[in-house]
């Protein structure tokens, strides 16, 4: 632990102003694991005037940073960029004559606070203004800066020509595209300072370029995936003050396709798993030894988990027995075509007959094949249907 | 049970149209293509085309693509396919078929007599 | 469109005996989501056609389990393990993996 300092398994506080810091402190080697400090605490650095780019990319799970009453004047740019945890930043009473919000951007700060230092009127900290309208808390910082006449004047006043948040304007055509196809999305950005513009696509699967100038880009995606379905396309318009960003969401539409089809497994109820893919929303259809299975409160449907084009579920049955032996296929369609699954069910063993043995269709109980499924003039034969798992109700009619 | 029933026996004159319907029961009307097949007098079984009764997207055999037209009203789950500028050689029975790429379900056909 | 072709036209058989009727597709009629969309049908006279086998070898609800359905690809077979006098009647293979869909045609007769 460096002099003037204390360390434990997650903190480092230096606050002993003698013989004090000249540079952020760094661990030893063989000590504690940096990735492991969560604070740094420093206070009464007079000579710590820097932090340079390197200082702090090895703490990268620290959350609160504090340099109070200290000498700090330059925060590289590059300082935080691995420390994505940061959350609380303290600054108070330093020698910081300007701060520029890249050091800050990729961060989800909820606190930073700069009071007490000697800012410098100027666009460059036009941002600090602008990130304390928008919180308008009560706990507003009383920041100052000083002006061309060496005059302290409140940063809530600050009025300085041609220097505002820029603005980002995406033309987008309708973002539902139909997988495969390409689009192109087309944005302008407008601002004083003149901002820069660049596309935030996320992870997105599909292949993509963009052309940029400083205030027009377009961004074409080609051969579009069905797994980019629901994500945000961003055109963001970024300056000194602060960025601006329009959004929009991908809808990409496509073919189902039944990716998990198992056999029943038995649970509170019995369950034939499944999870297809597909949107629009797929319409799901079961048969049952090749007829319409038409569902019932006995045998459903149900849709456990929907994660956005996904769909998890079951063919619930309740109580089947060995009438529900059979094979059950499962298509699903939407208007872009449709996919098709099946599996044989093995509920339990004929009565009386050896569970091993057992016939795995329950074609035995049709007999008279003269009155079967699709002879359809007859309305008494029910031969086509699934037989109910209501123990109540031997026919194959649910209601 | 699913049932498929079409409508009855009809006589046309050649050049004249016939609309043949197929009520759907048992099932969701709406959840399952119907397909139309004919089968002329002594020959084998020919596919027309199919319908989309959610949507009521069509698709039609290259043969009787501009002469067909299938429809549906799913308010009375049924199914219609009218057949335009007939001929002798139009004189079969018409089934209306479901529900998937087997066809599981027939109507029990409808006799359509082309004849001066 | 793709053609099927039946053989044999004319099946004499044996009431109690096995038959079996061979179906040929011009091409193959394995779908792009990985079935197979071939079903045979059995047409009675005066009736209208009737579902046996599906998807190649699943029988279809009800049906007696004297009829089987087998082949691949190209080629596919139905067998009656023991005709029945009830078994009499026009037999169909018909594909329903490409559009148009199409049928062949045979005859089953009973001796």
């Known amino acids: 632990c460096p002099t003037s300092c204390k360390c434990s398994a997650s903190r480092i506080w230096c606050s002993d102003p003698s013989p004090g810091i000249v540079a952020f402190p760094r661990l030893e080697p063989n000590s504690v694991d940096p990735e492991n400090i969560t604070e740094i605490f420093i206070a009464n650095q007079k000579r710590l005037e820097i932090i340079n780019e390197d200082d702090v990319e090895a703490y990268v799970g620290l959350r609160n940073l504090t340099i109070v009453d200290s000498g700090l004047k330059f925060v590289a740019h590059k300082a935080f960029l691995k420390n994505s945890n940061l959350q609380h930043i303290n600054f108070t009473r330093n020698k910081l004559t300007s701060l520029s919000r890249k050091h800050f951007r990729h961060l989800d700060l909820s606190e930073l606070i700069l009071v007490g230092n000697p800012f410098t009127c100027s666009c460059d900290i036009m941002w600090i203004k602008t990130l304390q309208e928008a919180k308008s808390s009560p706990d507003t910082q009383d920041l100052y800066c000083l002006n061309e006449s060496s005059k302290n004047i409140p940063l809530a006043n600050l009025q300085i020509p041609n220097c505002g948040l820029p603005s980002a304007n995406l033309a987008a055509p309708n973002l539902t595209v139909e997988e495969g196809k390409s689009i192109t999305l087309s944005c302008s950005v407008a601002g004083d300072p003149v901002p820069n513009m660049y596309w935030d696509v996320g992870n997105l699967v599909s292949k993509h370029m963009n052309e940029t100038s400083h205030t027009q880009g377009s961004l074409r995606i080609t051969n579009i995936s069905s797994d980019d379905s629901g994500k945000q396309i961003s055109c963001v318009a970024e300056n000194l003050v602060g960025e601006d960003q329009d959004s929009v969401n991908l809808t990409v539409h496509f073919a189902p396709t039944i990716t998990f089809l198992e056999s029943p497994t038995s649970d509170h109820h019995w369950c034939i798993p499944f999870t297809v893919k597909g949107n629009p929303k797929p319409a799901l259809q079961w048969f049952y030894n090749g007829a319409i299975l038409n569902e019932s409160k006995y045998i459903c449907t149900k849709i456990h988990v929907t994660n956005h084009t996904e769909y998890h579920g079951c063919l619930q049955l309740d109580n089947p027995t060995h009438m529900n032996n059979g094979d059950y296929t499962l298509i699903a369609k939407n208007e872009y075509g449709k996919d098709e699954k099946q599996i044989s069910a093995h509920f339990m063993g004929w009565p009386g007959i050896d569970d091993g043995a057992n016939p795995n269709y329950p074609d035995v109980i049709y007999e008279d094949y003269g009155t079967a499924a699709n002879d359809i003039g007859d309305t008494t034969n029910r031969s086509n249907e699934i037989p109910s798992t209501d123990v109540t109700d031997k026919t194959g009619r649910e209601h | 049970q699913v049932q498929l029933v079409q409508s009855g026996a009809e006589v046309k004159k050649p050049g004249a149209s016939v609309k043949v319907s197929c009520k759907a029961s048992g099932y969701t009307f709406t959840a399952y293509d119907m397909h139309w097949v004919r089968q002329a007098p002594g020959q084998g079984l020919e596919w027309m085309g199919w319908i989309d009764p959610n949507s009521g997207g069509t698709r039609y055999a290259q043969k009787f693509q501009g002469r067909v037209t299938m429809t549906r009203d799913t308010s009375i789950s049924t199914a219609y396919m009218e057949l335009s500028r007939l001929t002798s050689d139009d004189t079969a029975v018409y089934y209306c078929?479901?529900?998937?790429?087997?066809?599981?379900?027939w109507g029990q056909g409808t006799l359509v007599t082309v004849s001066s | 469109d793709v053609v099927m072709t039946q053989s044999p036209l004319s099946l004499p058989v044996t009431l109690g005996q096995p038959a079996s009727i061979s179906c040929r597709s011009s091409q193959s009629l394995v779908h792009s989501n990985g079935n197979t969309y071939l079903s045979w049908l059995q047409q009675r006279p005066g009736q209208p056609p009737r579902l046996l086998i599906y998807?190649?070898?699943n029988r279809f609800s009800g049906v007696p389990d004297r009829f089987s359905g087998s082949g691949a690809g190209t080629d596919f077979t139905l067998k009656i393990s023991r005709v029945e006098a009830e078994d009499v009647g026009v037999y169909y293979c018909m594909q329903g993996t490409h559009e148009p869909y199409t049928f062949g045609q045979g005859k089953l007769e009973i001796k």
């Open positions: 998807k190649i070898s």
């Open positions: 078929a479901g529900v998937t790429s087997w066809f599981a379900y």
